[in-house]
Every structure is written in structure tokens, then in C-alpha cells.
Amino acid sequence: KAMHVAQPAVVLANSRGTASFVCEYASPGKATEVRVTVLRQADSQVTEVCAATYMMGNELTFLDDSICTGTSSGNQVNLTIQGLRAMDTGLYICKVELMYPPPYYMGIGNGTQIYVIDPEPCPDSD
């Protein structure tokens, strides 16, 4: 048994620097406690963007200073990353861990390439 995680290949951030995508996992068991982590991979470096642990049926709770928000529905997690700029363009990987009950399972998506285009500044009007 293994856990497969699916996420879209490409997503475009909107003009306000917000990008949303769905992270879906095929759970081999009935998990009650799940941890979702968004990772950013640039070159061979992987860094954590945000993480949330939630009980099935409850809302995801990210830390107060997190740039992520999300909702869960069954084996789907709807993730939104805010405050993105052009320099944040990159591959965002969804990692899911079934923390409880045993056994533990971990699954990692192939990543979503998020493209961010900084808006053009408005021209000065006389």
C-alpha cells in the first residue's frame, strides 16, 4: 500500500499575487489526523512555504503569519498561497502525511509550477 498525491502541473497567480490549487491524496486507510505541507523547490533546494495539521472534517489551520490558507473536503485540500511576486515563480510541492491512526503514510506530489507576473505600475496621470 502507498499513498499517491496529485496536484495540477501549472497554475497562474492572479494580478494580486494569489495562486490556488487542489492537492488530492489517495488514502490507503482511514486517517483522522493529516498534515499538509507546501514545499518550494528551486534548483535542488527545498524549503517549507507553509504547513497545517488538521483533523478530518475540520478546517485547516495555518499559523497566523502564514501566506497560505486552505480548506479540506474528504481527501482533497484546496490550497491558496497569497502575497506572491514574480521572484516567487517556481515549483510548489504538496506533501501529505497521515499522522494518525497507524500506520503512518507519506505522499508527495509532482509539484505545481506557479507562474507569478508582477502587475505593471499604473502610468502617472496628469
Epitope: K1, A2, M3, H4, V5, P28, E33, R35, T37, L39, V46, T47, E48, A51, T53, I93, K95, M99, Y100, P102, P103, Y104, Y105, M106, G107, I108
Partner: antibody, heavy 118, light 108 residues
Framework: QVQLVESGGGVVQPGRSLRLSCAAS????????MHWVRQAPGKGLEWVTF????????YYADSVKGRFTISRDNSKNTLYLQMNSLRAEDTAIYYC???????????WGQGTLVTVSS | EIVLTQSPGTLSLSPGERATLSCRAS???????LAWYQQKPGQAPRLLIY???SRATGIPDRFSGSGSGTDFTLTISRLEPEDFAVYYC?????????FGQGTKVEIK
């Protein structure tokens, strides 16, 4: 840089207890799950136990279940292994290891030797 | 529990030669959550390969991993003197985390 330093090993009699510590530095300890792995003299690697980010979820190998307890203090950046009812077959080098973002054990301590002998 | 069986137990080769190490799983290792570690005497294991084929940071490109499902391979294209060590495979997709029994690569 990432560093894991184990301590607390030594010689102990069968049936007695020992507590190992693993001091972590160079990374945000609370953001990583952790493991203990052991290696008996001249033998291979054996996974012992795992602990989640906040310490709420713990998993154990059948060989130590009910005797060993893993814990962590995120405020002190330290991982612990409480070993009770020690047996001769628990004699090994005990390593603490960090789970990397993508799952494998990316950093290991230098190990601490536990010898269970009368 | 996923049981990992490594072969051969010992590999006797000369520097410059190619080393091929095998790791077979008792059941499918999901999404290739398989790692390879190198361990030298008196040292802790060091991560070489994760995800079956991705090299860890700082690992030279003479080390490569391949395989999927139940059969995995670690290849060292040209053995350097510092490569003579014991190599372990490990699955990390589910508990309990398991290691193979190891393959010793020794100087012929």
C-alpha cells in the same frame, strides 16, 4: 549548519533503564519529524522509533514497543529516547536522524553506544 | 511491513570499476519512496539517493539510482577509493520504516 549530537549512552545492566538525548541545532527543530535508528555491533541499520512535529504521534518498532518511549522538547531543540527493561539485544549504537522535507533521513547524529551487559 | 533484500551481500571490485547494487522489496514501494545510504566504518550513514533516483546535496554524479515498484538499483559508475563502504537501501513511504541488510563494497 545542521547538527545532531547524541548523548547518554553507556554500560547498563539488563532490566535497567537509560535515557538518550539528541541536541539539534542549525535548523527549526519543530518543523521536522525525527527518528531513532540503531545498529548492533557488526550488523545493519534498524529503525527504532519516530515522533511527529509536535510530539503527539509516535511509532515504534515491534522489538521495542512497550519498553522504549520517544519524546521531544521543541523549546530546547532536543529529542529523547527513554529505554526501560533493557535487554542484551538492545546493545547498539543509537543514532538520531532528521526526516528531510521529501522523506528520507537527510541528517544523522554521530551516534551513542549503549551496552547492555551484566 | 515492507521487507527489503539487498544483493549481493559483498561486492569485491577494484577502483575504477563499475558497481551495481540491488534492492528488492517484498511489496511495491509507493511512488519510489526509496533511499540509498552509504556508511563507512565508525561513521554515521550518509544519504546518497532519495526518490529512487534523485541525488542528495553534494553527492557526486558517479552515483545513480534507478528502478521502481519492487526492484531498485544503485550504480557507482567508477569506483573511487573513498567509495568502499557499506550501502543500505530504505523505504520511507510508510511505517514501519525499513532498511535492507546492506551490501559491502570492498577492495578486490
Amino acid at each position: 549548519q545542521v547538527q545532531l549530537v547524541e548523548s547518554g549512552g553507556g554500560v547498563v545492566q539488563p532490566g535497567r533503564s537509560l535515557r538518550l538525548s539528541c541536541a539539534a541545532s542549525g535548523f527549526t527543530f519543530s518543523h521536522y519529524t525525527m527518528h531513532w535508528v540503531r545498529q548492533a555491533p557488526g550488523k545493519g541499520l534498524e529503525w527504532v522509533t519516530f515522533i511527529s512535529y509536535d510530539g503527539n504521534n509516535k511509532y515504534y518498532a515491534d522489538s521495542v514497543k512497550g519498553r522504549f518511549t520517544i519524546s521531544r522538547d521543541n523549546s530546547k531543540n532536543t529529542l529523547y529516547l527513554q529505554m526501560n527493561s533493557l535487554r542484551a539485544e538492545d546493545t547498539a549504537i543509537y543514532y538520531c536522524a532528521r526526516t528531510g522535507w521529501l522523506g528520507p533521513f537527510d541528517y544523522w547524529g554521530q551516534g551513542t553506544l549503549v551496552t547492555v551487559s551484566s | 511491513e515492507i521487507v527489503l533484500t539487498q544483493s549481493p551481500g559483498t561486492l569485491s571490485l577494484s577502483p575504477g570499476e563499475r558497481a551495481t547494487l540491488s534492492c528488492r522489496a517484498s511489496q511495491e514501494v509507493g511512488d519510489s519512496y526509496l533511499a540509498w545510504y552509504q556508511q563507512k566504518p565508525g561513521q554515521a550513514p550518509r544519504l546518497l539517493i532519495y526518490g529512487a533516483f534523485s541525488r542528495a546535496t553534494g553527492i557526486p554524479d558517479r552515483f545513480s539510482g534507478s528502478g521502481s515498484g519492487t526492484d531498485f538499483t544503485l550504480t557507482i559508475s567508477r569506483l573511487e577509493p573513498e567509495d568502499f563502504a557499506v550501502y543500505y537501501c530504505q523505504q520511507y513511504g510508510s511505517s514501519p520504516w525499513t532498511f535492507g541488510q546492506g551490501t559491502k563494497v570492498e577492495i578486490k
